[in-house]
């Protein structure tokens, strides 16, 4: 059954009217408008864009559109004292310097205020020393270096290739290894797809291209100076020494031309295996230090960036609900970019703009959604999800009582192969039903549904005939809504073929070459993938805001809880002796999952049968659905991560981008064999099983009959 039939929701003509109003040509026009100059967070240009969006959303017909400002910690390079890295000889003379900025793309030579590549929030410093190549700087890479190869990174400058994990995790790992500086670079193995030309002739990264990005380890805190609370006019700010998540060692990013010059001289140990080799014509020696003739040469970093409290602006638009105005469905995506933001974020912002326009058109014709829809253009996402987090902190009491769902809308595309969806299990059925009603934009799937092309190209690893839907991790603005507040969340975009393109993200990510032309020439000339993403995101918002019964299926949560329990049990069972010694049992967790499954099944039966014309019962059932995600929140949060409060999902402690299931248990078990006090370590595993079992049981009980 479609969700419409299953829950007697939106009359189809309304949804159809909304979807039919979405136009690819408008998305194209909006993207062009949003990408002609840089819109870096905290700059005048981004403030002006905020005011433009506010004005246009009002014109489109929203009931109100307000700017919400906060004063948060941002980071910028010093305009007169540029950041760079040198090779110095024994006399201290700089014999090689890395590039100060990327050569501008054609047509953008005269654009001012292009921020040069930098690692946001790097401290200042001029460390010099021997280089150690640490592959991707993942946890396992440092294990390989320190435990297997006996290489000590203490007092060294490490060079790591971008990719696989969030850059902030790389820096954290390097700090823990004792490094005194980090150089991040884009290796062609990860950012240059074979058979594709480099920009401006294709979508590959040129040798002078560099990925910008923040290197924080905020763990959901938002503004580093005001964790837990909004950075408003009367905020109490921590001193910089107490700020959350700031790196303690200088960090700087470079392109592969510059990396070649640093890596070609490397001596010391050979790479441990082929997985440590990229595509440059260098040996990928680990070091430490340079080889023979060059052994007296050192690497020196020159980092002069500054951290500054700066005003940022969210745009918040409201379309009031006709029946349940106190129930909020939120569509949000960021507006700030590193440079032009051709993909990140403006391909998403342009889609949001068109969705707002379509909703506004329906509203002008007399229609209103059942529930209130909030639209958000977030600021300072690139600096640590700051705009969304501060707004959610300011409005947390309203959100935790009224928040139905959050749909994220960053980059609409990271490729043009198939759909990619990450969401709460509550939304699986919504996504399935919606994509069955939408046309596929893919070549070879003319006249077929999006569900069909998506399932064919990205099949679920568990369920045949169904598409892959991934866990939510972090690294985007849904984080505070899902991981902290427990509001059901989802995201959708078009992606690449992960089988054939093993590079990380898309090659021009966060570089100056992420332009309108990149999208218009190489990714989506007809803007048909953008339109499809608009239909998916907009369609989800429409259903969530307009269905009589919320389109959430709690049975899908039961299925994944069982899968996650099996997985974490398997991990633990790699230590059968210790489990026996310390009496570690997962019985309570499996029992809670079993109870959840039974209660969810009964709830779903009641959901089919109850009297939908009774507004009190309808509201009661909807509240049980709305508050189910909330029930997975532990008010105490995860160990050492108080703002990651969801017991079922959290960003991986080793990669912020990835989601981990039963993260409390997972982290307690991680590398447990190396713990100095095994009794204490297994005691923590038992405590985390207890917390997880209790939370699942408590969540199950929210679905029981109320009396």
């Amino acid at each position: 059954k479609s969700s419409n039939e299953a829950t007697n929701i939106t009359p189809k003509h309304n949804m159809k009217a909304f979807l039919d109003e979405l136009k690819a040509e408008n998305i194209k026009k909006f993207l062009y408008n949003f990408t002609q100059i840089p819109h870096l967070a905290g700059t005048e240009q981004n403030f002006q864009l905020a005011k433009q969006i506010q004005s246009q959303w009002k014109e489109f017909g929203l009931d109100s559109v307000e700017l919400a400002h906060y004063d948060v910690l941002l980071s910028y390079p010093n305009k007169t004292h540029p950041n760079y890295i040198s090779i110095i000889n024994e006399d201290g003379n700089e014999i090689f310097n890395t590039s100060l900025f990327e050569p501008p793309p054609p047509g953008y030579e005269n654009v001012s205020d292009i921020v040069p590549p930098f690692s946001a929030f790097s401290p200042q410093g001029m460390p010099e020393g021997d280089l150690v190549y640490v592959n991707y700087a993942r946890t396992e890479d440092f294990f390989k270096l320190e435990r297997d190869m006996k290489i000590n990174c203490s007092g060294k400058i490490v060079i790591a290739r971008y990719g696989k994990v969030f850059r902030g995790n790389k820096v954290k790992n390097a700090q823990l290894a004792g490094a005194k500086g980090v150089i991040l670079y884009s290796d062609p193995a990860d950012y240059f797809a074979p058979g594709v030309k480099s920009y401006p002739d294709g979508w590959n990264l040129p040798g002078g291209g560099v990925q910008r990005g923040n290197i924080l380890n905020l763990n959901g805190a938002g503004d580093p100076l005001t964790p837990g609370y909004p950075a408003n006019e009367y905020a109490y700010r921590r001193g910089i020494a107490e700020a959350v998540g700031l790196p303690s060692i200088p960090v700087h990013p470079i392109g592969y031309y510059d990396a070649q010059k640093l890596l070609e001289k490397m001596g010391g140990s050979a790479p441990p295996d082929s997985s440590w080799r990229g595509s440059l014509k260098v040996p990928y020696n680990v070091g430490p230090g340079f080889t023979g003739n060059f052994s007296t040469q050192k690497v020196k970093m020159h980092i002069h960036s500054t951290n500054e409290v700066t005003r940022i602006y969210n745009v918040i638009g409201t379309l009031r609900g006709a029946v349940e105005p106190d129930r909020y469905v939120i569509l949000g995506g960021h507006r700030d970019s590193w440079v032009f933001g051709g993909i990140d974020p403006q391909s998403g912002a342009a889609v949001v703009h068109e969705i707002v326009r379509s909703f506004g058109t329906l509203k002008k014709e007399g229609w209103r959604p059942r529930r209130t829809i909030l639209f958000a253009s977030w600021d300072a996402e690139e600096f640590g999800l700051l705009g969304s987090t501060e707004w959610a902190e300011e409005n947390s009491r309203l959100l935790q009582e009224r928040g139905v769902a959050y749909i994220n809308a960053d980059s609409s595309i990271e490729g043009n192969y198939t759909l990619r969806v990450d969401c709460t299990p509550l939304m699986y059925s919504l996504v399935h039903n919606l994509t069955k009603e939408l046309k596929s934009p893919d070549e070879g799937f003319e006249g077929k549904s999006l569900y069909e092309s998506w399932t064919k190209k990205s099949p679920s690893p568990e369920f045949s005939g169904m598409p892959r839907i991934s866990k939510l991790g972090s690294g985007n603005d849904f984080e505070v809504f899902f991981q902290r507040l427990g509001i059901a969340s989802g995201r959708a975009r078009y992606t690449k073929n992960w089988e054939t393109n093993k590079f990380s993200g898309y090659p021009l990510y966060h570089s100056v070459y992420e332009t309108y032309e990149l999208v218009e020439k190489f990714y989506d000339p007809m803007f048909k993938y953008h339109l499809t993403v608009a239909q998916v995101r907009g369609g989800m918002v429409f259903e969530l805001a307009n269905s009589i019964v919320l389109p959430f299926d709690c049975r899908d949560y039961a299925v994944v809880l069982r899968k996650y329990a099996d997985k974490i049990y398997s991990i633990s069972m790699k230590h059968p002796q210790e489990m026996k010694t310390y009496s570690v049992s997962f019985d309570s967790l499996f029992s809670a999952v079993k109870n959840f499954t039974e209660i969810a099944s009964k709830f779903s039966e009641r959901l089919q049968d109850f009297d939908k014309s009774n507004p009190i019962v309808l509201r009661m059932m909807n509240d049980q659905l709305m508050f189910l995600e909330r029930a997975f929140i532990d008010p105490l949060g995860l160990p050492d991560r108080p703002f990651y409060r969801h017991v079922i999902y959290a960003p991986s402690s080793h990669n912020k981008y990835a989601g981990e299931s039963f993260p409390g248990i997972y982290d307690a078990l991680f590398d447990i064999e190396s713990k100095v006090d095994p009794s204490k370590a297994w005691g923590e595993v038992k405590r985390q099983i207890y917390v997880a079992a209790f939370t699942v049981q408590a969540a199950a009980e929210t679905l029981s009959e109320v009396a």
Epitope: T98, P103, P104, K197, D201, G208
Partner: antibody, heavy 120, light 107 residues
Framework: DVKLVESGGDLVNLGGSLKLSCAAS????????MSWVRQTPEKRLELVAA????????YYTDTVKGRFTISRDNAKNTLYMQMSSLKSEDTALYYC?????????????WGQGTLVTVSA | DIVLTQSPATLSVTPGDSVSLSCRAS??????LHWYQQKSHESPRLLIK???QSISGIPSRFSGSGSGTDFTLSINSVETEDFGMYFC?????????FGGGTKLEIK
Amino acid sequence: DVKLVESGGDLVNLGGSLKLSCAASGFTFSGYYMSWVRQTPEKRLELVAAINSDGDNTYYTDTVKGRFTISRDNAKNTLYMQMSSLKSEDTALYYCARHEDGYWAWFVYWGQGTLVTVSA
Amino acid sequence: DIVLTQSPATLSVTPGDSVSLSCRASQSISNHLHWYQQKSHESPRLLIKFVSQSISGIPSRFSGSGSGTDFTLSINSVETEDFGMYFCQQSNSWPWTFGGGTKLEIK
């Protein structure tokens, strides 16, 4: 061995037209951006026009925009420049040169040049 | 357009001397600066790329330095074959431009 050989230079009247050619050999011509660089009688070097490897993107310096057209025939391994509405300041030795970095140009390989003289 | 100003216009030296040629950009060009040598009736020849990176086949007495707007080509102990014109070129932003040249002549 990489070789670039220009031809087509001549004495031409003010306002006249001329087509220069550059025959390339010793490398995969279709894999490289190419440029025309001219050297004035005063020995100044000036980049005139560039073309991408497929021939679908062209770039011109302001002084020749609308008058000169750079093109290429990858099947024939040949670079061209059609020059029209020639001015006396177009008098120069015209070199074809191969880019070593895609769009962003520095030049290892140059031809020997072909002389264009525009007379009143 | 980015203007590259080379100085001096002419430099008269004795073989064995060490010399420095200057190239100044009208705006920052990072390290996207290259040096060429041109002898009479010959095409330009690349000496140094990206400020300081040596080119195979070019003698090690040629070296480059600088960053941003100010760059230097140094010739350590000039030899007779080094006399001719020297040009700098930027590849930072279109149109790629050359300096006016420095003529290195025998004193």
